[in-house]
Interface confidence: medium
């Protein structure tokens, strides 16, 4: 049986979670993709959403999330920005692609945000948005109220995530070299 | 592709719990809304309730008071505990894999396990 | 919780006739969701259309359904030998998740 697991990733108040999830470019590129939070004992809540038809290199903010899919590289890009210890728990990046269920990216995420220095001014967060570089032209996309029935099971690839702090300029350089090759066949 | 099998006592007697597992096999227990539904003998099929991974559960409101649903995804197995149970329990009773539509409660049962008939006698 | 009544409760036809199952709900089923099983003796229900009219994967294109609110239909163009089995319909859009009755279809 093939069972997902966990990649823990901890962290400190005011830095950046940043991971990259791979797909299939032919399948996925234009499918709505999500960033969901899984807390126990509760069913997957959608944080965030890319539009529908997701839009190549289109920044999508919602509150301290950002996503980016970039359709020349099958590569989506989620942010969580000026990270807090509440957001603290258990992740994973979606597709949506009616009328599939949605498909899981990769190994789930275990974030742990704890107090302590990052080098920044951590938790306030009119300081750290000066510092990062967010695209001005983001959009805020609703999430589809639903999606259908998956029909097939397929594994998913894995993910690689970055960490970074608000001293750094947030850009995409070398994706060439993070992404890995897709399960999805 | 993805299996089901369900494992557990055949006979239980009337008062006691009638406990039940399900092995998944062939796909992930991530993800999945894990059900388990009975069918008395002749009769139709009525839905128990399911659990998420996350260890969600949701039972359907007739059976709730007497229904313990548990998973362990280590092991890729979901079990099923009714208590104080009497002849109307006795069913084949099956487990299914639901998925869901987005900001719904309900599953749809794409794969079902053959059923395992448990009767309720003394 | 929601109702649902299928009718006939027994179909008899011939292979290559065309069978026309139908389900009744006591109150709407909200977005369409309906699914179809098909169950033969000692086997577990098999998943043919959800959401009212989409098929299943692996299911033939013979099987087909329709319907909304509170009608729901089921329909086998060209009956084969492996289709005589028992039907049941399935609303997942209000809980309790509830199921219909059944309908036989028998040989004639």
């Known amino acids: 049986a093939t069972k997902l697991t966990e990649e823990k990733y901890e962290l400190k108040e005011g830095q950046t979670l940043d991971v990259k999830c791979d797909y299939t470019l032919e399948k996925f590129a234009s499918s709505q993709k999500a960033w969901q939070i899984i807390r126990d004992g509760e069913m997957p809540k959608t944080l965030a959403c890319t539009e529908r038809p997701s839009k190549n290199s289109h920044p999508v903010q919602v509150g301290r999330i950002i996503l980016e899919d970039y359709h020349d590289h099958g590569l989506l890009r989620v942010r969580m920005v000026n990270l807090q210890v509440e957001d603290s728990g258990l992740y994973q990046c979606v597709i949506y692609q009616p009328p599939k269920e949605p498909h899981m990216l990769f190994d789930r995420i275990r974030l742990v945000v704890t107090k302590g220095f990052s080098g920044t001014p951590g938790s306030n967060e009119n300081s750290t948005q000066n510092v990062y570089k967010i695209p001005p032209t983001t959009t805020k996309a609703l999430c589809p109220l639903y999606t259908s029935p998956r029909t097939v099971t397929q594994a998913p690839p894995k993910s690689t995530a970055d960490v970074s702090t608000p001293d750094s300029e947030i850009n995409l350089t070398n994706v060439t070299d993070i992404i890995r090759v897709p399960v999805f066949n | 592709q993805v299996q089901l099998q369900e494992s557990g006592p055949g006979l239980v007697k009337p008062s006691e719990t009638l406990s039940l597992t399900c092995t998944v096999s062939g796909g992930s227990i991530t993800n999945y809304y894990w059900t388990w539904i009975r069918q008395p003998p002749g009769k139709g099929l009525e839905w128990i309730g399911y659990?998420?991974?996350?260890?969600?559960?949701n039972y359907n409101p007739s059976l709730k008071s007497r229904v313990t649903l548990s998973i362990d995804t280590s092991k890729n197995q979901f079990s099923l505990k009714l208590s104080s149970v009497t002849a109307a329990d006795t069913a084949v009773y099956y487990c299914a894999r639901g998925v869901l539509w987005f900001g719904e409660l309900l599953p749809l049962l794409d794969y079902w396990g053959q059923g395992t008939l448990v009767t309720v006698s003394s | 919780e929601i109702v649902l009544t299928q009718s006939p409760g027994t179909l008899s036809l011939s292979p290559g006739e065309r069978a026309t199952l139908s389900c009744r709900a006591s109150q709407s089923v909200s977005s369409s969701y309906l699914a179809w099983y098909q169950q033969k003796p000692g086997q577990a229900p098999r998943l043919l259309i959800y959401g009212a009219s989409s098929r299943a994967t692996g299911i033939p294109e013979r099987f087909s359904g329709s319907g909304s609110g509170t009608d729901f239909t089921l329909t086998i163009s060209r009956l084969e030998p492996e289709d005589f089995a028992v039907y049941y319909c399935q609303q997942y859009g209000s809980s309790p998740l509830t199921f219909g009755g059944g309908t036989k279809v028998e040989i004639k």
């Open positions: 659990i998420y991974d996350s260890g969600y559960t």
